[in-house]
């Protein structure tokens, strides 16, 4: 492929080295005032400036108070562990004026047998052990406390739960003579919630359980259990909701069948079938009841588990998710993409769109990407003219008392947003693609042709003139 241009998307760099300032000491919660963004949409810049100056005047202006970091807390109950037996934990940044809590589940694939777990332990140990976790993490995207980066929930209490159980947040088995590794993902979530109750969560109005990739699937698997846990512990007034980003996978047929040797080559159904046994994985009770014993793996797939969930869940999913394409053995690099691959990719987009038809709250741009909500560019992507933070805000508003029973969005405030154009990056607001050598941004037509997209063939397929197709692509229609 020498001489061919290559493309690169922004984002996905390793986090910066951790900073280690001390976190502010906890104080008494203060009631926050609600901010209604609808009133200021015409002049968001001046609104942001007002918010910023208000925030600065309300805070004692010490560097310590304005510290952006989330601080590590290892679980006090050390029997709830990462794969290697080290204690699990969470990163917390309290916002004492807020009764909103955001709990974010990290992603990072999984392992499903001793061999690939051993290999993961020697390569990605931070995803299996807490031994080397930094003392602090910086919140980005939906975890940011900056209104510019997070116009949705910047003032919330932020909790980042590192993924160290390799079980798609489903496991409930401890390390023993027989088990070389513990798989306690589901128990880690329960224990974090229990500990947070003593740190202010008890006064919460809304708990949003969010996650990306394997963490997004983890949301679907655990959101009802968290709601049930809080009810049992005597906190029925806390509204539990879910936000599943890039975790809505399809158990479809691979483009090219491959043996289930390694995590990223293994067909989704094969991997989860094996994993659920190896992890002693738990699935939501109502979903489990729908499938016979041994068929619980079905509940790891969004479109099967979603109809059984009681808690409201907002689904964010790229129509052309890179992780889905990876497990389906579609690799959009190197050689020009063959016609068979294009048909497969288009069909994937169609299938995914179909599974979101009955999902009340969704945001599904026609982009080739993976994960979005903790990326700093999460505010930039739009579907039908609405950004993700705006759609989440509209979803939030649908729960306000006057709209309690309402399942339909208010006029001008949509939250079921699924792209209908058929190709990767046919949405012009997709994360930027740049030519690797020149650094120039590419438009969608350049990108698609660059990947071997045959305009003649596709135009014929769609029953239109090649020139018309090119025009459509360039305009992102």
């Amino acid at each position: 492929s020498e001489g061919r241009k290559t493309w690169r998307r922004r984002g996905q760099q390793p986090p910066p080295p951790p900073r280690t300032e001390a976190a502010p000491a906890a104080g008494q919660p203060v009631e926050s005032f609600p901010l209604d963004f609808t009133a200021v949409e015409g002049n968001m810049d001046s609104f942001m400036a007002q918010v910023k100056s208000l925030a600065q005047s309300l805070y004692p202006c010490s560097a310590q108070q304005l510290n952006e970091d989330l601080r590590l807390h290892l679980l006090l109950n050390t029997s709830v562990t990462c794969n290697d037996g080290s204690p699990a934990g969470y990163y917390l940044k309290e916002s004492r004026g807020s009764r909103r809590w955001l709990l974010f589940l990290e992603g990072g694939w999984y392992c499903f047998n001793r061999e690939n777990c051993d290999s993961r332990y020697d390569t990605m140990r931070r995803l299996m052990s807490s031994r080397d976790w930094p003392r602090t993490r910086t919140g980005t995207g939906i975890l940011s406390s900056q209104p510019e980066e997070n116009p949705y929930w910047w003032n919330a209490n932020m909790v980042f739960i590192p993924y160290c159980s390799s079980d798609v947040w489903s496991g409930a088995s401890s390390k023993s003579e027989k088990n070389e590794y513990a798989f306690m993902g589901a128990l880690i979530i329960q224990e974090v919630v229990r500990e947070l109750l003593g740190r202010g969560l008890s006064g919460a109005k809304v708990l949003l359980l969010a996650g990306s990739s394997a963490g997004g699937t983890g949301v679907l698997l655990n959101v009802d259990r968290v709601a049930e846990q809080l009810e049992k512990l005597g906190y029925p007034a806390i509204q539990v909701r879910g936000l599943a980003d890039s975790g809505w996978f399809l158990d479809n047929k691979q483009y090219r069948r491959s043996d289930c040797i390694d995590t990223i080559n293994c067909a989704p159904t094969d991997a989860i079938r094996r994993g659920i046994r190896y992890w002693s994985g738990m699935v939501p009770e109502r979903c489990q009841r729908q499938f016979k014993e041994g068929e619980e793996w079905n509940c790891f797939f969004g479109y099967k588990v979603y109809p059984t969930l009681r808690c409201p869940v907002f689904v964010v999913q790229w129509l052309f998710d890179e992780a889905q394409l990876t497990v389906d053995n579609v690799h959009l690099t190197g050689q020009p993409v063959q016609e068979g691959q294009w048909l497969y990719i288009q069909n994937l987009g169609r299938e995914l769109r179909g599974t979101l038809k009955d999902v009340q709250a969704s945001f599904a741009p026609a982009c080739l990407s993976h994960e979005i909500i903790i990326r700093s560019y999460w505010t930039d992507v739009q579907v039908k003219g609405t950004s993700l933070p705006r759609a989440l805000h509209c979803w939030d508003r649908s729960f306000h008392d006057s709209h309690k029973a309402s399942k339909t969005p208010m006029k001008g405030c949509p939250f079921h947003l699924v792209d209908s154009c058929p190709w990767p990056h046919c949405n012009p607001s997709c994360p930027t693609i740049r030519d690797q050598f020149t650094g120039q941004e590419m438009n969608v037509a350049q990108f698609l042709m660059h990947m071997g997209f045959d305009v003649q063939t596709v135009a014929q397929q769609q029953g239109m003139e090649p020139s018309k197709l090119l025009g459509m692509l360039s305009n992102g229609n």
Epitope: T123, M124, D132, T326
Partner: antibody, heavy 119, light 111 residues
């Protein structure tokens, strides 16, 4: 000082055997997955074998599967590669390398030992 | 196995100029905010030396003129300004799964 030192290379006839060793010092050997690589004259780097930190899992390149055996002794801080049924195409510089457990990159390499298979 | 395609195979750069080496993976090598791609320098008669790990992190002791970028499947090593001692062969390597494969190498010559 963190270091890896290979030994055991030499000249051997096709079909013969050889055992390479790699002595580790300056770090907690049992914490790391270890690998063998080789590099034929004027060629690129080729991965040969891997053994996990706890010795439970081993992987081999298809080109050496069934002929080479990787092992380690964490008490003695040594890594070994037993090579049998050697072929002329196994002629190369052999390196042991430490795999960093938070990234899978090879941050420490030995200086190498030469294996020549020739009649 | 993940195939890494490195380009160009060789490169001649004037002293003080920029050298850019690319590496493309046949599958995505990024997950959870980390890109499992690394860069090494090898001089004749020496073992490889780690320069950049996890796509963009400089190994300690490596001069700041070396930098790495990229995500997903496409990665770049930049050297600027190039110095005499940078004449060597450069390899990319992924660690997303076993086996850990290397690119075929780029030989950098200083003009």
């Amino acid at each position: 000082e963190v270091q890896l030192v290979e030994s055991g290379g030499g000249l051997v006839k096709p079909g013969g055997s050889l055992k390479l060793s790699c002595a580790a010092s300056g770090f907690t050997f049992s914490d790391y997955g270890m690998h063998w690589f080789r590099q034929a004259p004027e060629k690129g780097l080729e991965w040969v074998a891997y053994i996990s930190s706890g010795s439970r899992t081993v992987y081999y390149a298809d080109t050496v599967k069934g002929r080479f055996t990787i092992s380690r002794d964490n008490a003695k801080n040594t890594l070994s590669l037993q090579m049998t049924s050697l072929r002329s195409e196994d002629t190369a510089m052999y390196y042991c390398a430490r795999k960093h457990y938070n990234g899978g990159y090879f941050d420490v390499w030995g200086t190498g030992t030469t294996v020549t298979v020739s009649s | 196995d993940i195939v890494l395609t490195q380009s160009p195979a060789s490169l001649a750069v004037s002293l003080g100029q920029r050298a850019t080496i690319s590496c493309r993976a046949s599958k995505i090598v990024s997950t959870s905010g980390y890109s499992y791609m690394h860069w090494y320098q090898q001089k004749p008669g020496q073992p490889p030396k780690l320069l950049i790990y996890l796509a963009s992190n400089l190994e300690s002791g490596v001069p700041a003129r070396f930098s790495g970028s990229g995500s997903g499947t496409d990665f770049t090593l930049n050297i600027h300004p190039v110095e005499e001692e940078d004449a060597a062969t450069y390899y990319c390597q992924h660690s997303r799964e076993l086996p850990p494969t290397f690119g075929s190498g780029t030989k950098l010559e200083i003009k």
